[in-house]
């Protein structure tokens, strides 16, 4: 391991079209890839009226938009579908949006997911 | 290094079947999942198939649903495609190609191909 | 199933020159998009993953842009080798589909 890294090992997995991609719709997914490479957690969700729908959770393959972050977090302006990703085991548990626009009071909405 | 090479291919009657393989070799081949992508003589590439790790998970396009087969045997580092009612459409080279997930599924990398021409 | 679009279909270029190929999908993919090369009687490869990504081997010329629906694959000084076809391809959802390619020829 690399000293300062968190090495991502298995995340949170969830699939909403788990029924047509013939997959589970939700456990722990081990992370696999090549020795030189970085893993990741990512999710991805929609905002339905104030409704939180996840799309998909699992392991993402190196991206350097997510090394080094220990927290799942979307930055984007309202984006259709939201994306985060981050390093560490499980870290896509939770996930959040933040949007990095110039605004006096940033706005915070920590998701915890129950999938249905 | 990653080598991935198919055969199986060849010339076969419409309705006829064939089964390709696709060997792996320098890759743990057990936590890839693995796909095949077809390619019709001048035409663009068309993803056929997919497979995960260990079998659990198959998927398939729809103009082959319900005639060809995904499978692997990862004790002999192969994935193969059973292909039924093989029709003129079906001519192509195939190529089979590794994810590293099921999900985020870039092909990073791709074997030599195999042609199947069915004709009659 | 998620309809790629690319553009242009094929184009002449010089080398040297600054290209850059676009790829819609018909809806939000996020960042679900890769971009391969293809040259005559040979397999793809790999160029550009989760839609920013330099795949390995890569060189930096290549770099990928976008996110959503609209992406961009750019050679930043096009050499001998690029000239090829070039291939995007979304990976949201199942069936996994490619754009219809871009062929880049020499001028």
């Known amino acids: 391991a690399i000293l300062g890294r968190s090495e991502t090992q298995e995340c949170l997995f969830f699939n909403a079209n788990w029924e047509r991609d013939r997959t589970n719709q939700t456990g722990v997914e081990p992370c696999y890839g090549d020795k030189d490479k970085r893993r990741h957690c990512f999710a991805t969700w929609k905002n339905i009226s104030g409704s939180i729908e996840i799309v998909k959770q699992g392991c993402w393959l190196d991206d350097i938009n997510c090394y080094d972050r220990t927290d799942c977090i979307e930055k984007k302006d309202s984006p259709e579908v939201y994306f985060c990703c981050c390093e560490g085991n499980m870290c896509n548990e939770k996930f959040s949006y933040f949007p990095e626009m110039e605004v006096t009071q940033p706005t915070s909405n920590p998701v915890t997911p129950k999938p249905p | 290094e990653v080598q991935l090479l198919e055969s199986g291919g060849g010339l076969v009657q419409p309705g006829g079947s064939l089964r390709l393989s696709c060997a792996a070799s320098?890759?743990?081949?057990?936590?890839?999942?693995m796909n095949w992508v077809r390619q019709a003589p001048g035409k663009g590439l068309e993803w056929v198939s997919g497979?995960?790790?260990?079998?659990?998970?198959?998927s398939y396009a729809d103009s082959v649903k319900g005639r060809f087969t995904i499978s692997r045997d990862n004790s002999k580092n192969t994935l193969y495609l059973q292909m039924n009612s093989l029709r003129a459409e079906d001519t192509a080279v195939y190529y089979c190609?590794?994810?590293?997930?099921?999900?985020?599924?870039?092909?990073?990398?791709w074997g030599q191909g195999t042609l199947v021409t069915v004709s009659s | 199933d998620i309809q790629m679009t690319q553009s242009p279909s094929s184009l002449s270029a010089s080398v040297g020159d600054r290209v850059t190929i676009t790829c819609r999908a018909s809806?939000?993919?996020?960042?679900?998009l890769n971009w391969y090369q293809q040259k005559p009687g040979k397999a793809p490869k790999l160029v550009i993953y989760?839609?920013?990504s330099l795949a390995s081997g890569v060189p930096s010329r290549f770099s990928g842009s976008g996110s959503g629906t609209d992406f961009t694959l750019t050679i930043s000084s096009l050499q001998p080798e690029d000239f090829a076809t070039y291939y995007c391809?979304?990976?949201?959802?199942?069936?996994?589909?490619f754009g219809g390619g871009t062929k880049v020829e020499i001028k």
């Open positions: 190609a590794r994810s590293a997930t099921w999900h985020d599924t870039h092909l990073d990398y």
């Open positions: 320098g890759f743990t081949f057990s936590s890839y999942s």
């Open positions: 497979i995960n790790y260990n079998g659990g998970y198959k």
């Open positions: 809806q939000s993919i996020v960042r679900y």
């Open positions: 989760a839609a920013t």
């Open positions: 391809q979304q990976s949201y959802e199942l069936p996994l589909t």
